[in-house]
Amino acid sequence: NFMYSKTVKRLSKLREYQQYHPSLTCVMEGKDIEDWSCCPTPWTSFQSSCYFISTGMQSWTKSQKNCSVMGADLVVINTREEQDFIIQNLKRNSSYFLGLSDPGGRRHWQWVDQTPYNENVTFWHSGEPNNLDERCAIINFRSSEEWGWNDIHCHVPQKSICKMKKIYI
């Protein structure tokens, strides 16, 4: 009876996600057969989050909208380890929007999920950010410094990275 009700709950939760994520990839968390964590197929997973590299070229606003219709946000990078994971799936000759912007052009950077902007956990390329008209952040590759962040005009179409919390069933 307990197993039956757990299965019913799982099915109803899966139905919630079906519109945008018809297929989920789930792994068993820990030793308990009851606890599964899932990411939409073909998203990748790291710690408690799922990531998707969007290859369509869009402005920052539309990139964020694209993520949001999938139940995600543009990526918020909280640690060096997280960035190191993300860059494994990026192409060196492309740039990708992050969920970081400076809407007023006053160098008050803010993350889309309201995570406080911590200057100590940022990975700007040297000399960046450097232009008040460039109010959105990308991650890109520079041969001299490897992967890092750069400010860019928000209307210039780029690829992007979406991030969402893992789905627990």
């Epitope: 369509g56 070229m57 869009q58 402005s59 606003t61 539309k62 909208k65 694209n66 219709v69 232009n131 008209d133 460039e134 860019i152 005009h153 209307h155 210039v156 179409p157």
Partner: antibody
Framework: QVQLVQSGAEVKKPGASVKVSCKAS????????IHWVRQAPGQGLEWMGT????????SYNQKFKGRVTMTRDTSTSTVYMELSSLRSEDTAVYYC???????????WGQGTLVTVSS | DIQMTQSPSSLSASVGDRVTITCRAS??????LAWYQQKPGKAPKLLLY???TLAIGVPSRFSGSGSGTDYTLTISSLQPEDFATYYC?????????FGGGTKVEIK
């Protein structure tokens, strides 16, 4: 007032290149991105690509990739669109357009007719 | 790439008529749609953006509606200066494709 003034009409032979200019005035040149759109005679409109004058970042329509190059000269507030390996089907009016704060084309140049003929 | 299909390609109407032009996208463009008016030998002029927001200086007889993949431009009472060609354009992702155009002619 905002103005985009384009260079004059050009006649080119197949295989040649053409460089069309678009001089901006009436606003801060480096604050808005510029797009290029073309229109063949009696036909519809076709988006070619965009350039951010502040840093020169570009994004091109794949259809023209390898043939189109967009550049800018901040000292004269001018953007350029160069199309190479011209063929007769490139005969068109070429427009530059500014993308406004609302992310739509709010101002357009007057257009430049490029004729490709042997 | 998202394709934009505009219909009709041409129509004949009289001054005072109500005119409707439709634009269908091959995918959801989330209301990121503009409508332009173009007269012979001139550059296009922005009429509406975000599917339904009137651009500055555009008369209120022009209106737009729609969502998802289907959008409409309506001219409530056609005026002599409205005879022109109308284009839709999406701005969801590149390439920012245009519809094929609708020529509005005098009946």
């Amino acid at each position: 007032q905002v103005q985009l003034v384009q260079s004059g009409a050009e006649v080119k032979k197949p295989g040649a290149s053409v460089k069309v200019s678009c001089k901006a005035s009436g606003y801060t040149f480096t604050s808005y991105i510029i797009h290029w759109v073309r229109q063949a005679p009696g036909q519809g409109l076709e988006w070619m690509g965009t350039i951010y004058p502040g840093r020169g970042d570009t994004s091109y329509n794949q259809k023209f990739k390898g043939r189109v190059t967009m550049t800018r000269d901040t000292s004269t507030s001018t953007v350029y669109m160069e199309l190479s390996s011209l063929r007769s089907e490139d005969t068109a009016v070429y427009y530059c357009a500014r993308m406004g704060d609302n992310e739509y084309f709010d101002y357009w140049g007057q257009g430049t007719l490029v004729t490709v003929s042997s | 790439d998202i394709q934009m299909t505009q219909s009709p390609s041409s129509l004949s109407a009289s001054v005072g008529d109500r005119v409707t032009i439709t634009c269908r996208a091959s995918g959801n463009i989330h209301n990121y749609l503009a409508w332009y008016q173009q007269k012979p030998g001139k550059a296009p002029k922005l009429l509406l953006y975000d599917a339904e927001t009137l651009a500055i200086g555009v008369p209120s007889r022009f209106s737009g509606s729609g969502s998802g993949t289907d959008y409409t431009l309506t001219i409530s009472s056609l005026q002599p200066e409205d005879f022109a060609t109308y284009y839709c354009q999406h701005f969801w992702s590149t390439p920012y494709t245009f519809g094929g155009g609708t020529k509005v002619e005098i009946k």
